[in-house]
């Protein structure tokens, strides 16, 4: 088996250390194997074989140390973790995420109170009464909390017409309030007395376009924690009833309004004041906001747009979209079911990602069953524990600065894993302050370049042209991005992550993210594209490699070599086919050949009852349904006619 | 430990009315919905009405509307159920109970209407 | 109202073995159902609530179930202290209504 610390010709202990885990480095001023080199980078056995003796061998082992003492969590164990990593090698712990039995709720109804609502908010004067005894089986202590919105105050989402201005749902013969963002209307109490009459008192309101300000809302109602009253130890639940999609970021423009959202809270006097200054948030920072405040989204939709809220689910963990019936009958139920699957759920997500670390979890559901640590365990109940299996990998070491901790956050908890990371880089015998030894091996060295004195290495520059740092002659030396040291480029260290390559034109930083994760954190980023691990592909690394055979025909063939395989879905490039594998395509040569006798069955004038009779025999199979509306092009396309 | 304290046995003539009490000790009266419970000798049980203690919010079975009045006093942490215009049917032990997950009942007051 | 109908009213069965109790409603009720342990002394205890979570202190021999409009208690191995009389009861909409009851013996 190829030793990979042998052969790679390390020239440092740090190089040698970077290697693999396997490899350790003998600092032994003495230690020499004979021959033409010395081969002071190996396996730990190899080196003691050889002579060299075990407290000379630098060898940084994994550790994984979790303090017992000063465990504060309840429900996610252990809160705090300190591995130390060396390249290539990985460590492992188990965290058990244990949901209470009953936990505190906060339900906060945020209500568009566009015309459309008007009937279903007649609704909600009666949901507190009896929701708090339906959720009574749930929580022993239940708040309710409310909040209205519109849209944006500023033209063309609402009418400024000056008779409009104030009355937007004239058309509805309904007295409104004037439009708004967002305004905070009762904070979390347990009064259900309060929120009855604070619900009574609500008045509809009324905007022009479809989509409603919405996003915008939830973002303030997540951030504004005091305003809201959202308590540390409760659940966090986010009522969204609507009938209307949402607008996202970028819609604004059209309004002049090109202030990127901020994600901080802006409400004064209970009311969101930078409605008419700043973006609706992106679905990646309302994702992030409602993630970093623990909150739960309960999307209440009545009418066909429920689907549009379905779609979103997958990009905002921890939340759930349900139907309401005609005014809102059945919107507690709703709210009963949506608490139960929140609460019998656990996933995990990895926050505040390390550079250069790599986080692999699985868990280890309660029935046994072992699933991705982001989809998690579900029908978990108060009893039960659910454990995840955490690997940690660092593949390099060529990390510089940075963030030396990860979170690992189960969705919709108030608790976390903190995840110290120290990374093993550095070999002792580099450290002036430890006993000195060899950390270059200087049979390696160029001698016309490197000059060198004890461990310490400069170089003689001048004799080496710049012309063979660049790529080209016209390009600048090292791409830019570096220096040239004896006519090899010595990469720039950028905060952004690594630069490299011969020219230092590649770099690990600029591959396409996937969930706030650089290649989905299941790949490699290198000049620009990522290079997934065995088990993952896709541009960013995202799909597992077993679903490309969702792609694959009954003839063997992806996509029918129609299409390209996205996650083990046909994505058609040729934009005449369509179906599961791209494998219908009407209008394509040779559908239009083999089926010449059956398309003029498709457009029956003029035909003899011969034909008529044998286009009901011969072309009965013949899925028409994909050639009625595409059949003008075999017709007119001259190849067809002759 | 949660308790609910109800009086004792009430014999009362037709025509009057009658106060049960329910006592709670152990826990936040105030935040759990307090139900009463009818059940007439060899019968089953009829829901008769509840209220929040916190919020005075009630809600009552339509066929008691009339006979019976449910209310709170928090200072005391006592609820009643007062019971008008007595007849031979109302001749039953009535219950208290915290209503939720953690659900406790009171050990029944049995009101016996006799002339 | 949502009426609350019990099968059977009463049953006789052996120690150690799986009695079943049946709850219909007129109506769909979402699964809030209780079920609830009237013992021969009078004194009431909340068995099972929302279907079918056990409430705390509830041997695990206690099992509920069902959706729509019915539902059924499962005592999985009878026991001398399981003799009572057993009532469901919907708590989906005003006013809440109990079944008839199901008094279980022990044979």
């Known amino acids: 088996e190829d030793n990979r610390c042998a052969s790679s010709n390390a020239a440092s202990c740090a190089r040698c250390l970077a290697l693999g885990p396997e490899c350790g480095w003998c600092v032994q001023e003495d230690f020499i194997s004979g021959g033409s080199r010395s081969e002071r980078c190996d396996i730990v056995s190899n080196l003691i074989s050889k002579g060299c003796s075990v407290d000379s061998i630098e060898y940084p082992s994994v550790h994984v140390i979790i303090p017992t003492e000063n465990e504060i969590n309840t429900q996610v164990t252990p809160g705090e973790v300190s591995i130390q990593l060396r390249p290539g090698a990985e460590a492992n712990f188990m965290l058990k995420v244990h949901p209470l039995k009953k936990y505190p709720v906060d339900l906060y109804y945020l209500v568009d109170v566009s015309a459309s609502m008007h009937n279903n908010i007649e609704k909600l004067n009666s949901v507190g009464n009896d929701l708090s005894r339906k959720m009574a089986f749930f929580s022993r202590d239940f708040r309710l909390g409310f909040g209205s919105y519109v849209d944006k105050t500023v033209s063309p989402y609402i009418s400024i017409h000056p008779e409009r201005i104030h009355n937007q749902c004239s058309d509805y013969n309904l007295d409104c309030m004037p439009p708004h963002g967002y305004i905070h209307v009762l904070s979390l109490t347990e009064n259900i007395t309060e929120f009855e009459k604070a619900v009574h008192r609500q008045k509809i309101s009324g905007n022009i376009d479809t989509p409603e300000g919405g996003f915008d809302a939830m973002l303030q109602a997540a951030v504004c924690e005091s305003h809201i009253g959202w308590r540390k130890e409760a659940k966090r639940l986010l009522l969204v009833m609507t009938d209307q999609t949402s607008h996202l970021a970028l819609d604004s423009k059209l309004a002049g309004i090109v202030v990127p959202n901020d994600g901080n809270c802006h409400l004064k006097n209970n009311v969101y004041v930078k409605s008419t200054t700043m973006e609706h948030p992106s679905l990646g920072q309302l994702s992030e906001k409602l993630i970093d405040n623990n909150i739960n989204v309960i999307f209440a939709v009545q009418g066909k747009q429920f689907h549009w809220y379905k779609d979103l689910l997958p990009l905002l963990p921890g939340t759930i979209a349900g139907e309401i019936e005609s005014k809102a009958a059945n919107l507690n139920n709703l709210v009963v079911e949506a608490y139960q699957k929140l609460i019998s759920e656990v996933k995990v997500q990895v926050e505040n990602q390390v550079q250069g670390i790599y986080f692999n979890i699985t868990a280890i559901c309660p029935d046994g069953s072992r699933k991705p640590g982001m989809e998690g365990c579900r029908n978990v109940t108060s009893n039960d524990e659910v454990l995840f299996n955490v690997t940690v990998t660092m593949k390099k070491c060529d990390v510089t600065g940075g963030k030396n901790y990860a979170i690992i956050k189960p969705i919709g908890f108030n608790e976390t894993a903190k995840i110290h990371i120290h990374r093993n880089c550095s070999c002792q015998c580099e450290d002036n302050r430890g006993p000195k030894g060899k950390c270059v091996d200087e049979t390696f060295l160029d001698s016309k370049c490197f000059q060198c004195d004890e461990n310490k290495c400069h170089f003689d520059e001048d004799q080496f042209s710049s012309e063979s740092c660049k790529s080209h002659k016209d390009q600048p030396v090292c791409s830019g991005r570096g220096v040239c040291v004896c006519g090899k480029c010595s990469c720039h260290k950028i905060k952004l992550g690594k630069v490299y390559g011969k020219y230092c034109e590649k770099d690990d930083f600029s591959c396409p993210y996937h969930h706030g994760n650089l290649c989905a954190g299941h790949g490699e980023c290198e000049a620009g594209r990522c290079q997934c691990f065995s088990g993952w592909e896709g541009d960013r690394c995202q799909c597992p490699s077993a679903a490309a055979q969702h792609c694959v025909n009954s003839k063997g063939q992806v996509c029918s070599g129609r299409g390209t395989c996205v996650c083990g879905r046909c994505e058609c490039t040729d934009p005449r086919s369509i179906g599961r594998f791209c494998e219908h395509c009407p209008t394509c040569y040779t559908a239009c050949k083999e089926n010449w006798n059956c398309m003029q069955c498709l457009h029956p004038h003029n035909l003899s009852q011969a034909i008529l009779d044998q286009c009901k025999t011969s072309c009965a199979l013949m899925e028409q349904q994909h050639y009625v509306d595409q059949t003008s092009e075999c017709f007119s396309s001259p190849s067809y006619l002759r | 430990e949660v308790q609910l304290q109800q009086t004792g046995a009430e014999l009362m003539k037709p025509g009057a009315s009658v106060k049960i009490s329910c006592k709670a000790t152990g826990y936040t009266f105030s935040t759990y919905w307090i139900e009463w419970i009818k059940q007439r000798p060899g019968h089953g049980l009829e829901w008769i009405g509840h209220i929040l203690p916190g919020s005075v919010i009630t809600n009552y079975n339509e066929k008691f509307k009339g006979k019976a009045v449910i209310t709170a006093d928090t200072s005391s942490n006592t609820s009643y159920m007062q019971l008008s215009s007595l007849t031979s049917e109302d001749s039953a032990v009535y219950y208290c109970?915290?209503?939720?997950?953690?659900?406790?009942w009171g050990q029944g007051t049995l009101v016996t209407v006799s002339s | 109202d949502i009426e609350m109908t019990q099968s059977p009213s009463s049953l006789s069965a052996s120690l150690g073995d799986r009695v079943t109790i049946s709850c219909s409603a007129s109506q769909g009720i979402s699964n809030y159902l209780n079920w609830y342990q009237q013992k021969p002394d009078g004194t009431v205890k909340l068995l099972i609530y929302?279907?079918?979570s056990l409430h705390s202190g509830v041997p695990s021999r206690f099992s509920g179930s069902g959706s729509g409009t019915d539902y059924s208690l499962t005592i999985s191995n009878l026991e001398p202290e399981d003799i009572a009389t057993y009532y469901c009861?919907?708590?989906?909409?005003?006013?809440?209504?109990f079944g008839g009851g199901t008094k279980l013996e022990i044979k």
């Open positions: 109970a915290r209503w939720g997950w953690d659900s406790y």
């Open positions: 009861q919907q708590y989906s909409d005003l006013p809440y209504t």
């Open positions: 929302y279907t079918s």
